[in-house]
Structures are given as structure tokens and as C-alpha cells.
């Protein structure tokens, strides 16, 4: 069941999710001088059976400008209006990340991606929020949130986390955060995070496929 | 108690646009994504997409993505939706529908209706 | 998109029958919900995450099923529940609805 509303928002913290719950969409877009082909699905879908997810459906991008030139490119929509951006930086090793069962791992990026990430989170998620860089965590439980339904209606758990302005950067779960995942990502920012429940995540291709560039969506 | 309020009934010419309105009230309006679902005559219930009122943020069925677009203004309370290049096959009634997970409150509905 | 498929698509019974409404999906969902609709009027919610009452809505309207498969069922049909019903999945993009049941009287 998708969730239709937005994990909360903390002051001075992002979130993220370190896997997705079978169920989960990514907008299948193609950015700017590309376009989804016409049979093209617009989203990917996690799903699985008892043993392995994985992302179904390929999106593949057509420039805009050569009508019968094809590249399949990571499921990245463009963004709709201009943001202002951020850059930071996660060295991500996919093949040590744990696998969880009933989800899918983050999608390796590919060439030509677009701008961002659109994830369209279900019931049963889980995201886990860090403090961005220049501020550090004060914890009163878990830094996570995970999205339920009551009567109908899908929300988000509110994390038990207060970031303080102070000069280290708190890390994501299992960075020196004992109580949450331990399969998280190190990541530092320097603004507040629109976290929405269409997770927009950046990314580029840096020295290898196993290095993100991530740049998350401000306001 | 919470309210979804359509804008009125439309006649127009092929060809043409038209913005249908969804005043809401009694609850926090960018709390709760807006959607759109559409029924021509004699036929059953087709979802068109939602709006974030709070981001602007907009998500299509692709059926629609080139005919409807979703809009809000959070100083009034109020999404639209503009359906443009209107042809026969668009006269349907349109409702404004409260999201947050299952549609518990709906407008009263708009005909727009597409006749030369 | 998951199809969803109602049966049968017009019912003609009588007041005290007992109704039963069934919605097929294409894939495997997680929930299924039900609308009522009478002629000139919105939609209203009457189940919801495939067997829980909307408020305000009669203990006789029941809802079961799961994967693929779903019912809808009134024990014993009153004047007031000659409507047209819609099965809904809110699972995946596009949401889709059944083409819709009509409960007419016989």
C-alpha cells in the first residue's frame, strides 16, 4: 500500500533509505534532452518472491533531438522546477550492503540519468535520518521513521531525534549510531533536507560504481 | 468539519481549456496530497493524479499526463485542475478527492461538458 | 497498471437478499478498498483496507479477501444500499478502480 504522505521533517537532518520495501515505485524519467519512450514504463517496481527482490521494468530514453538514437538510462526524473542543490559525497560499497529480505537495494546509477530521484514509498518503510553537516544528534530513541496506516490513512512514525548546532557531523545508522540499521551511509549536507515521500535523490557516476555523488533537493 | 467545494458546472468548445477549482476547509490543507479522479457519463471511476499543495509536487496517470495539469494555491486552500485541448471523449463529471491514503472526503463533483 | 475486474457488473436483488460483489486484480495487491455511489452524488467510502467499516457505515457491509481475489458482502440488502459500488487499489501507480457494480432492485 503506498504511502500518502511525507516522512516528517526534522530541522537541521535528512533522511534516507538504505533499502526499499517490495512495492516501492521509482519514477522512470529521462533528463533534460532525453525522453521515456513511448512503450516505455514510467516507473520501477520492487518486487520479489520469498528469496530475492529486485527492480522491475527498464527505462530507456530517447534523445529528444535524435528521433531513433535509444540509451537505457537509470529511472531519474528531471526535476520539475529549478532547486537549489547541495552536493554531497557517500562512498557506497553495493556489494557489501546487507540484503534484506522483502527489499530492494538502491539502483546502481547509469549513464545519462536524470537530475533526481522520485521514490514512492509503501506502507512499512523505513527511512533513517541523520543530522546535516555542522550539527550534532541528540537522541531520545530511534532516528528513524517508518510509514503505517491507521484506519485507512498512511503515516509517518516521528523520529526521536534533535540536531544541535555543534561542529561533527552525525552519521547515518550503523556509523557510531548503536540503536538503528546497520547497514547505513555516511553523509554529510549543508542545508535542510524537503524530505517527501517522494524520496529525490542526485546521483552521477564518480570514480567508480561504487562511489555516489548524491545531491538532495532543498528548499 | 472538513469540506472539498468544486467550482460549478462548464460547457465548452472543442478545442478549448478549463480549470475546475477544489476550495477545502476544516483541516490543514498542505497536510494532505489533493487528488483528481474523473467519470465520464455512465461510466466508472478513472484517477488522474494528485498534487503536493504544499511543494506543488504533482504525480499523473499517464492517460492524463498531456491532457490535465494539477495545480494549488495554499493562500486560498485551493486546487485546480486545467484540462486543456478538450475534445467530446473529456465531458465527464471531475471530483477533487482528500488523499492522506483512502479517499475519505470527495467535492461534490464538476460536469465539464466538451460540445460544439 | 493493475486491472481490476468486478463481478458481475449488475445485480438485480431484492430487499433482505444477501449480496455479494467480487473484485479480481491483475497482480497481487496489498489491500482492497470499496466505494458507494448513488446517481448525482461523489463517491463515498464504505470499506477500507479490505474489511475495516468506514465511519458511519452499517455492520451489515462486510469485506474479505486478499493476494488477488476480493469480496464485498451485504448480509441483507436495505432500500438505501441500490447503489453502484467500485472496488479500489491504492498499491501501486496507477490507481485504478473496478469498471463499477450496480445494485438494482429486482
Known amino acids: 500500500e503506498l504511502c500518502d504522505d511525507d516522512p516528517p521533517k526534522i530541522t537541521h537532518a535528512t533522511f534516507k533509505a538504505v533499502a526499499y520495501k517490495e512495492g516501492t515505485m521509482l519514477n522512470c524519467e529521462c533528463k533534460r534532452g532525453f525522453r521515456r519512450i513511448k512503450s516505455g514504463s514510467p516507473y520501477m517496481l520492487c518486487t520479489g518472491n520469498s528469496s530475492h527482490s529486485s527492480w522491475d521494468n527498464q527505462c530507456q530514453c530517447t534523445s529528444s533531438a535524435a528521433r531513433n538514437t535509444t540509451k537505457q538510462v537509470t529511472p531519474q526524473p528531471e526535476e520539475q522546477k529549478e532547486r537549489k542543490t547541495t552536493e554531497m559525497q557517500s562512498q557506497m560499497q553495493l556489494a557489501d550492503q546487507v540484503s534484506l529480505p522483502g527489499h530492494c537495494r538502491e539502483p546502481p546509477p547509469w549513464e545519462n540519468e536524470a537530475t533526481e530521484r522520485i521514490y514512492h514509498f509503501v506502507v512499512g518503510q523505513t527511512v533513517y535520518y541523520q543530522c546535516v553537516q555542522g550539527y550534532r544528534a541528540l537522541h531520545r530513541g530511534p532516528a528513524e521513521s517508518v510509514c503505517k496506516m491507521t484506519h485507512g490513512k498512511t503515516r509517518w512514525t516521528q523520529p526521536q531525534l534533535i540536531c544541535t548546532g555543534e561542529t561533527e557531523p552525525s552519521q547515518f545508522p550503523g556509523e557510531e549510531e548503536p540503536q538503528a540499521s546497520p547497514d547505513g551511509l555516511p553523509e554529510s549536507e549543508t542545508s535542510r533536507l524537503v524530505t517527501t515521500t517522494d524520496f529525490r535523490i542526485q546521483t552521477e557516476v564518480a570514480a567508480t560504481m561504487e562511489t555516489f555523488i548524491f545531491t538532495t533537493e532543498y528548499q | 468539519q472538513v469540506q472539498l467545494v468544486q467550482s460549478g458546472a462548464e460547457v465548452k468548445k472543442p478545442g478549448s481549456s478549463v480549470k475546475v477549482s477544489c476550495k477545502a476547509s476544516?483541516?490543514?490543507?498542505?497536510?494532505?496530497?489533493m487528488h483528481w479522479v474523473r467519470q465520464a457519463p455512465g461510466q466508472g471511476l478513472e484517477w488522474m493524479g494528485y498534487?503536493?499543495?504544499?511543494?506543488?509536487?504533482?504525480e499523473y496517470n499517464q492517460k492524463f499526463k498531456d491532457k490535465a495539469t494539477i495545480t494549488a494555491d495554499e493562500s486560498t486552500n485551493t486546487a485546480y485542475m486545467e484540462l486543456s485541448s478538450l475534445r467530446s471523449e473529456d465531458t465527464a463529471v471531475y471530483y477533487c478527492?482528500?488523499?492522506?491514503?483512502?479517499?475519505?472526503?470527495w467535492g461534490q463533483g464538476t460536469l465539464v461538458t466538451v460540445s460544439s | 497498471d493493475i486491472q481490476m475486474t468486478q463481478s458481475p457488473s449488475t445485480l438485480s436483488a431484492s430487499v433482505g437478499d444477501r449480496v455479494t460483489i467480487t473484485c479480481s486484480a491483475s497482480s497481487k495487491i496489498s489491500y482492497m478498498h470499496w466505494y458507494q455511489q448513488k446517481p448525482g452524488k461523489a463517491p463515498k467510502l464504505l470499506i477500507y483496507t479490505t474489511s475495516d467499516l468506514a465511519s458511519g457505515v452499517p455492520a451489515r457491509f462486510s469485506g474479505s479477501g486478499s493476494g488477488t481475489e476480493f469480496t464485498l458482502t451485504i448480509s441483507s440488502l436495505q432500500p438505501d444500499d441500490f447503489a453502484t459500488y467500485y472496488c479500489h487499489q491504492r498499491s501501486t501507480y496507477p490507481l485504478t478502480f473496478g469498471q463499477g457494480t450496480k445494485v438494482e432492485v429486482k
Open positions: 498534487i503536493k499543495p504544499s511543494r506543488g509536487y504533482t
Open positions: 476544516g483541516y490543514t490543507f498542505t497536510s494532505y496530497r
Open positions: 478527492a482528500r488523499g492522506g491514503g483512502v479517499f475519505d472526503y
